[in-house]
């Protein structure tokens, strides 16, 4: 699996999960998270070879005519696979909240 | 919807579906489909700003945060999202059969 | 390389103020939190609060009842903590510590401040 | 107000010993908690962030485990130059408490 265990413990150069630390202030220009200022939230990257850990029939029939033409720009991409959610702290008012923000850390990749 | 409704009728510049035509022969080396001898494959292609179709709470992060790290390498990619199956015809000896391939053409598209 | 050098020691009678600086080098001074402990002597770690030099916005710690107050500098990437009407068991080391990643990750050497009539 | 209890006090041990510090949060903090080494006349320097990833520069036999509100700092095997106090913080909502300290 195209993975954080795998990708971040090797070059993978292909389709994979890359390491990327978000702060929400600084990149998102948002305020209303108190906690936490950032995190990781992780992307994906890397060319999509045939075979290469492809999603549908369709990505693998993409990646057979971008093998026969080179120079095409149908090509399938990297995306995430698997996503966790984050817990977070926001305030209304002068009261602290916890939720979970659904699908916001990527853990794994595929090619779409 | 970034569907070939709006995509086919439209000069979208940003992630739609695009029309791509597929011989099986000549694009993917395939002889062993007798008919069709290709199909209206398409695909997706186009950048993902903020707010454009985006599929997830981290599609939506990630295209923040590339308004606001242009030269970023991180960013959401138009990818299909609505697939439809392609009936062919293929031989078994001398006799012909038909079946569905699912997943080989695709309706629409987003930002993932 | 990222360093945070704190002003030198200094000696306060009861009831006045005090203003501690951090100057900054080595990262984005406006795009990260900056702490502020205070240490007694022979005693743990207290967090007193922090400042985002890039807009200003702060949290305080309550113990401390409004007597910090946390400004920044943007031009000379410099962070500051005031503490005012002082008493004798605020007499104490005090670091300024830039947040990052859920932790702080560097800290200036400690500023010692006493408080003696 | 996120308390957090350290224990133990304080350690006696012998070179090339196995240390385990414990923390414990009032409350969930998932996994926003630091540990710090502190020596005498010194700043704290931080070790571990994110409850279990080693900060740069920190060598190997310092580890950290656990999430949500019991934690673990580790140190596999005690060099003479560990000899400190140690804290833990959280950064679950300021106030960011810390811990009383292990000696």
């Known amino acids: 699996a195209l993975d954080t265990n795998y990708c971040f413990s090797s070059t993978e150069k292909n389709c994979c999960v890359r390491q990327l630390y978000i702060d929400f202030r600084k990149d998102l220009g948002w305020k209303w998270i108190h906690e936490p200022k950032g995190y990781h939230a992780n992307f994906c990257l890397g060319p999509c070879p045939y075979i290469w850990s492809l999603d549908t029939q369709y990505s693998k029939v993409l990646a057979l005519y971008n093998q026969h033409n080179p120079g095409a720009s149908a090509a399938p991409c990297c995306v995430p696979q698997a996503l966790e959610p984050l817990p977070i702290v926001y305030y209304v008012g002068r009261k602290p909240k916890v939720e979970q923000l659904s699908n916001m850390i990527v853990r794994s990749c595929k090619c779409s | 919807a970034l569907d070939t409704n709006y995509c086919f009728s439209s000069t979208e510049k940003n992630c739609c579906v695009r029309q791509l035509y597929i011989d099986f022969r000549k694009d993917l080396g395939w002889k062993w489909i007798h008919e069709p001898k290709g199909y209206h494959a398409n695909f997706c292609l186009g950048p993902c700003p903020y707010i454009w179709s985006l599929d997830t709470q981290y599609s939506k992060v990630l295209a923040l945060y590339n308004q606001h790290n242009p030269g970023a390498s991180a960013a959401p990619c138009c990818v299909p999202q609505a697939l439809e199956p392609l009936p062919i015809v293929y031989y078994v000896g001398r006799k012909p059969k038909v079946e569905q391939l699912s997943n080989m053409i695709v309706r629409s598209c987003k930002c993932s | 390389e990222v360093q945070l050098v704190q002003s030198a020691a200094e000696v306060k009678k009861p009831g006045a103020s005090v203003k501690v600086s951090c100057k900054t080098s080595?990262?984005?001074?406006?795009?990260?939190?900056m702490n502020w402990v205070q240490q007694a002597p022979g005693a743990g770690l207290d967090w007193m609060g922090q400042?985002?030099?890039?807009?200003?916005?702060?949290n305080y710690n309550g113990k401390f009842k409004g007597r910090v107050t946390l400004t920044a500098d943007t031009s000379t990437s410099t962070a500051y903590m005031e503490l005012s009407s002082l008493r004798a068991e605020d007499t104490a080391v005090y670091y300024c510590?830039?947040?990052?990643?859920?932790?702080?990750?560097?800290w200036g050497q400690g500023t010692l401040v006493t408080v003696s009539s | 107000e996120i308390v957090m209890t350290q224990s133990p006090a304080s350690l006696s041990l012998s070179q090339e010993e196995k240390v385990t510090i414990t923390c414990r949060a009032s409350?969930?903090?998932?996994?926003?908690l630091a540990w710090y080494q502190q020596k005498p006349g010194q700043a704290p320097k931080l070790l571990i962030y994110?409850?279990?990833n080693l900060a740069d520069g920190v060598p190997s036999r310092f580890s950290g485990s656990g999430s949500g509100t019991d934690f673990s700092f580790t140190i596999s095997s005690l060099e003479p130059e560990d000899v400190a106090v140690y804290y833990c913080?959280?950064?679950?909502?300021?106030?960011?408490?810390f811990g009383q300290g292990t000696k």
């Open positions: 510590a830039r947040h990052y990643d859920g932790s702080t990750d560097y």
């Open positions: 080595g990262y984005t001074f406006t795009s990260s939190w």
């Open positions: 400042i985002y030099p890039g807009d200003g916005d702060t």
């Open positions: 409350e969930n903090i998932y996994s926003n």
């Open positions: 994110a409850a279990t």
């Open positions: 913080q959280h950064f679950w909502g300021t106030p960011y408490t």
